[in-house]
Amino acid sequence: APTSSSTKKTQLQLEHLLLDLQMILNGINNYKNPKLTRMLTFKFYMPKKATELKHLQCLEEELKPLEEVLNLAQSKNFHLRPRDLISNINVIVLELKGSETTFMCEYADETATIVEFLNRWITFCQSIISTLT
């Protein structure tokens, strides 16, 4: 059974992931980003189901495409380079989902824009955090 300290650690990691995803979204999703329209032409694959930490496998698999789109943005709104930002997210995702479990991600038929993709994973983080508190 999860201990209170492991629950607390999971919660902190999810909060960190949530903040990173929100920072990316805020950095790109405004009219002051002249690359926004072109960024919206990139397709992202969404999880068929995202209710447990193991489903973060689906996010992990989309981190490389996310980095490529963020490289296009070259946004001054990010304190870190896209590579470092995605690397940080990747570390958190690996810790949260656990590296021992082999979970095959199932994707939904409908693809999404970067904004929809980020909002989906932000909602996921908020949902899991709410079950932990």
Partner: antibody
Framework: QVQLVQSGGGVVQPGRSLRLSCAAS????????MNWVRQAPGKGLEWVTL????????YYADSVKGRFTTSRDNSKNTLYLQMNSLRAEDTAVYYC????????????WGQGTMVTVSS | SYELTQPPSLSVSPGQTATISCSGD??????AYWYQQKSGQAPVLVIY???RRPSGIPERFSGSSSGTMATLTISGAQVEDEADYFC???????????FGGGTKLTVL
Amino acid sequence: QVQLVQSGGGVVQPGRSLRLSCAASGFTFSNYAMNWVRQAPGKGLEWVTLISYDGSQKYYADSVKGRFTTSRDNSKNTLYLQMNSLRAEDTAVYYCARDSTTLGAFDVWGQGTMVTVSS
Amino acid sequence: SYELTQPPSLSVSPGQTATISCSGDAFPRKFAYWYQQKSGQAPVLVIYEDTRRPSGIPERFSGSSSGTMATLTISGAQVEDEADYFCYSTDTTGTHRVFGGGTKLTVL
């Protein structure tokens, strides 16, 4: 309603210059990046240039780089395209088009203005 | 430079289904957009993000994408659908905006 009204086309000799204008109304012009797209007679559409919402960033197709300059005056809600060193292959209908902030495409277009480069 | 390839023309009878293809290497990761352009008029967006229809566009217009191919389908084409149709996207880096060569749809 949301509208883009163009002016400034015409016939011009090779090597000469021409300036096109695009007046915006019905939306907050200063919140949108704007584009110019052209279409040669009987041909397809070709993206020409993009200017950011505040005019600080500009991008050009290779075919016009160094010859065309896009600019905007947000106080007048107007977009411009300055075309220098014009060539016969620049003959086309030129459209101004608004960059959508929610789609990855152009969502509002001007009516188009014809530019003919001929001696 | 990145290219989108469309058939130059297509002819269907009224009521038939018109299917216009657009081939592009980046489509597994890039959305396709479709513009309709009637003679002497500015283009109008009829499909965005592969499958979505802007408000005001009739339900007979639909889009799909699989692999490197995007498709615009007009189910039960009508005479007023006669126009040029252009697919649009950006290259794999998102840097260059690209239109297909256009498909002239004749409905007679």
